[in-house]
């Protein structure tokens, strides 16, 4: 109780150049506090000086690095101040260039299984950190596989669940410097699929179109699906389209493909918005085939 | 379940002094720190101060310094207030309250005791 | 000390109604704001803790928002049983200080 907390908002991975805000709360209200830094680089600005509840840190640089305490005032401790807090790691990206993060078989992931997450760049990173997306914990740490045209890690993650899913982001670092991190990955979005019984799909005016002929997908569900999501195989990436109740009582959403040039497999899946990386069963793939043309897939 | 359990209503001369007693059960009582509360019709609510239940550690409001004492007694798990010299100024309904967490400060009350300063 | 100012001091409303209570600190606590709800004859309970989240067990209809110095409590639809005395509290630096309190009585 008389130790106190010390966090990081919006969060302990920032990117250079920006801003954050180490908080300390005491449970018995002393709010002056000092700080100070374990390793990496000294930061001049924390010495000597009593903050109030909380500082707002930066614009944050490579040396801003490193791992962060606090001890609150304690008029009752020999020493006017209370045991040090809880270790904060804050981490600086942006200090190398990104690498490139890939899901394995793909970034769509049938509920119970597992999909292997890729991460590597042309930089020889001795470590890489998964970040998802609104989760405030430290990023996982992964030991990278050096090789001569850079790095590589692979992180197998499953068996897939709604809590898993989300918006993955990986960075690099080297091992002397293990708190300075790279610019992010691209996001990739992970997505639960096989929660819910799967919609239907189906091509206006037809499945089978002429070259430059307008054709709408339209995929539907007795479910109260928000969103519905078109993907073509062989494509990353999908369409999306927020669902509206037809006279029928189905939840529909019309895809105008445009002037098609060449055909393929679709399928559609529905979700909600409260669970935005849970969808459902896909729908039974609907091939479109355009005629005309000597492209059919 | 958590519960706080105050000592009865005093009824109490000005100029002497009252001791109001908090019991906690339910929970490890020495895990929690546990906040004094005041309520009066003049001034609504009143934080008096908080006492660690494990290190005795204790943070007054300012205006209470003096007024309040707070203690606690970890083998019965029970925390006291002294309020001295009082006045009818100090008739109130006095709370206990358990913290849950660095963010939630007042999560348990006791069921308060109301005392009555009176010549 | 912060002072938080509290208006209404009272409300009366019918079932049903949507009820809104403001609280402005006199300065900014950034999202350290909880509040409670005192029945008659009972101890304060508390609903709403740092700005938005809800406690324990607090029906959805009770929601709270805000940051800096201005904030919000809402009541969606008011139940019978709501009747009662609202607060809000600055949990930001100690001493800890209270709202003068809504008082929302059912017509």
């Known amino acids: 109780q008389d130790k106190p907390f010390l966090s990081a908002w919006p969060g302990t991975v920032v990117s250079e150049g920006q801003h954050v805000t180490l908080q300390c709360r005491s449970r018995l209200g002393f709010n002056e506090f000092s700080l100070s830094k374990e390793d990496g680089m000294p930061v001049p600005e924390l010495y000597n000086r009593i903050f109030r509840n909380s500082f707002l840190m930066g614009p944050v640089t490579p040396a801003h690095a490193g791992t962060y305490r606090c001890c609150s005032s304690h008029p009752h401790s020999p020493t006017g101040w209370s045991a040090p807090s809880n270790p904060v790691v804050i981490m600086v990206t942006g200090v190398h260039r990104k690498p490139s993060l890939l899901a394995h078989p793909g970034p769509l992931v049938k509920s119970g299984e597992t999909v292997i997450l890729q991460c590597w760049s042309d930089v020889r990173f001795e470590r890489f950190l998964l970040h998802r997306e609104g989760i405030t914990e430290d990023p996982l740490r992964l030991v990278g596989q050096l090789h001569d045209a850079g790095s590589q890690v692979n992180y197998s993650m499953g068996p897939m669940t709604p809590a898993l899913a989300g918006t993955y982001r990986c960075f690099g670092s080297v091992t002397h410097l293990p708190y300075e991190l790279s610019a992010p990955s691209d996001p990739l979005d992970i997505v639960v699929v096989g929660l819910y019984g799967k919609p239907s799909l189906s091509a206006q005016p037809g499945p089978t179109v002429q070259a430059g002929e307008n054709v709408t997908l339209s995929c539907s569900s007795r479910s109260l699906f928000d969103i519905y999501h078109l993907s073509r195989e062989a494509e990353a990436g999908e369409l999306r389209l927020t669902a509206v109740l037809r006279v029928n009582g189905t939840f529909q959403a019309n895809f105008p493909l445009g002037p098609v040039t060449h055909g393929g497999n679709y399928r559609c899946f529905g979700s909600f918005r409260a669970l935005p990386h849970a969808w459902s069963d896909p729908s039974d793939p609907l091939p479109v085939s355009v005629t005309g043309n000597s492209r059919h897939l | 379940q958590v519960q706080l359990q105050q000592s009865g209503p005093d009824l109490v001369r000005p100029g002497v002094s009252v001791k109001i007693s908090c019991k906690g059960s339910g929970y490890t009582f020495t895990d929690y720190a546990m906040h004094w509360v005041k309520q009066s019709h003049a001034k609504s609510l009143e934080w008096i101060g908080v006492?660690?239940?494990?290190?005795?550690?204790?943070n007054y409001n300012q205006k209470f310094k003096g007024k309040a004492t707070m203690t606690v007694d970890k083998s019965s798990s029970t925390a006291y207030m002294d309020l001295a010299r009082l006045t009818s100024e100090d008739s109130a309904i006095y709370y206990c309250?358990?913290?849950?967490?660095?963010?939630?400060?007042?999560?348990?009350w006791g069921q308060g005791t109301l005392v009555t300063v009176s010549a | 000390s912060i002072v938080m100012t509290q208006t209404p001091k009272f409300l009366l409303v019918s079932v049903g109604d949507r009820v809104t209570i403001t609280c402005k600190a006199s300065q900014s606590v950034s999202n350290d704001v909880a509040w409670y709800q005192q029945k008659p004859g009972q101890s304060p309970k508390l609903l709403i803790y740092y700005a938005s989240n809800r406690y324990t067990g607090v029906p959805d209809r009770f929601t709270g928002s805000g940051y800096g110095t201005d904030f919000t409590f809402t009541i969606s639809t008011v139940q019978a049983e709501d009747l009662a005395v609202y607060f809000c509290q600055q949990d930001y630096s100690s001493p800890w200080t209270f709202g003068g309190g809504t008082k929302l009585e059912i017509k």
């Open positions: 309250a358990r913290d849950s967490s660095y963010y939630v400060r007042f999560s348990y």
């Open positions: 006492i660690s239940t494990d290190s005795g550690t204790t």
